[in-house]
């Protein structure tokens, strides 16, 4: 899988979408889970509800919300009030039993609020460091990895 | 028990090479990277280079590149560090460690050390 | 490559008090800081990574915080098996770079 980055901006919302196949994954409830480093285990954050009819309502936990368009075959996570501890490597996962697949791996960066001059320092600005090198941008939000290219950042 | 052991202490002449190994016991390496870290007398720690032994892609410091070959051996959970063209200043004690990579991997193993000598 | 600076590279205090070091990165590196603790004659042993989680095991005096650029490592209450070299190192991109140490020495 390659891994998907996904920017967003400190205290605002980001919202990362999963797209899938609707066929092959009909009828399985889907999760967002947290990777502990790049072979680290993955847990999880949210998942869609009990009842896969169901999988359009959105369920929370905390600040992390999940809805599931089932003909659609696309995954929606909301990160509200986006912090700098919620970067990281996550994964949409697609459940079966007690197996997951990985639909796709998701870098959350977290940029700073260029209207919040308090703690400018702390953040981000897009056009200072690359966490990837040479990166393709995909649009404003989201960024591909290339074929083969190691994910740098873990640190651990 | 989780645990790394390191091959023993080796003095080496300048321009020679060095092997180091480093033995995982108690955990698969291949779902590890694998570090190399090396500290010179009194002084800090300098990240020299990893290796993913799933894959046996690595990756080196620029300093250490062309100089540096980290391998695995997935075999024996074995991961190795030669360095050739020794000079004095490569004197120092060369540490393993495994962990699951960036993004706030919570597993970290060292190696209990390797102390290099070079001298003539 | 990314440079890590600490502050300061050395300091001297009593068991209880409480100690502050700080960690600058060169550039931007997110929450991507680890600490390490080192005593001599032995290897690193990690105590908060991601900027500002403990790491398994380790004593809850021990605390980080920062992004960015500026990072912080605090103990609450100093004891006596604290004295040793302290390390932050950057997770952000490779090559890993280090701090050049911080020793905690007995006032």
């Known amino acids: 899988h390659n891994t998907t980055v996904f920017q967003g901006v400190a205290g605002q919302s980001l919202q990362v979408s999963c797209p899938y196949d609707s066929m092959k994954h009909w009828g399985r409830r889907k999760a967002w889970c947290r990777q502990l480093g790049e072979k680290g285990p993955c847990q999880r954050v949210v998942s869609t509800h009990n009842l896969w009819l169901l999988s359009f309502l959105r369920r929370w936990n905390g600040s992390t919300a999940i809805t599931d368009d089932t003909l659609g075959g696309t995954l929606t996570i909301t990160l509200r009030n986006l912090q700098p501890h919620d970067a990281g490597l996550y994964q949409c996962q697609s459940l079966h039993g007690s197996e997951a697949d990985t639909l796709r791996k998701v870098l959350v960066e977290v940029l700073a609020d260029p209207l919040d001059h308090r703690d400018a320092g702390d953040l981000w600005f897009p056009g200072e460091s690359e966490s990837f090198e040479d990166a393709h941008v995909e649009h404003s939000i989201s960024r591909s990895l290339l074929e083969g290219e190691i994910p740098f950042p873990p640190t651990s | 028990q989780v645990q790394l052991v390191q091959s023993g202490a080796e003095v080496k002449k300048p321009g020679a090479s060095v092997k180091v190994s480093c033995k995982a016991s108690?955990?698969?390496?291949?779902?590890?990277?694998i570090h190399w870290v090396r500290q010179a007398p009194g002084q800090g720690l300098e990240w020299m280079g990893w290796i993913d032994p799933e894959q046996g892609d690595s990756k080196y410091a620029p300093k250490f590149q062309g100089r540096a070959t980290i391998t695995a051996d997935t075999s024996t959970s074995t991961a190795y560090m030669e360095l050739s063209s020794l000079r004095s200043e490569d004197t120092a004690v060369y540490y393993c460690?495994?962990?699951?990579?960036?993004?706030?991997?919570?597993?970290?193993?060292w190696g209990q050390g390797t102390l290099v000598t070079v001298s003539s | 490559d990314i440079q890590m600076t600490q502050s300061p590279s050395s300091l001297s205090a009593s068991v209880g008090d409480r100690v502050t070091i700080t960690c600058h990165a060169s550039?931007?590196?997110?929450?991507?800081l680890s600490w390490y603790q080192q005593k001599p004659g032995k290897a690193p042993k990690l105590l908060i990574y991601k900027a500002s989680n403990l790491h398994t095991g380790v004593p809850s005096r021990f605390s980080g915080s920062g992004s960015g650029t500026d990072f912080t490592l605090t103990i609450s209450s100093l004891q006596p098996e604290d004295f040793a070299t302290y390390y932050c190192?950057?997770?952000?991109?490779?090559?890993?770079?280090f701090g050049q140490g911080t020793k905690v020495e007995i006032k």
């Open positions: 460690h495994a962990d699951h990579g960036n993004y706030g991997s919570t597993m970290d193993y």
């Open positions: 190192q950057q997770g952000q991109t490779y090559p890993r770079t």
């Open positions: 108690g955990f698969s390496i291949e779902d590890f990277y």
């Open positions: 550039q931007h590196i997110n929450v991507w």
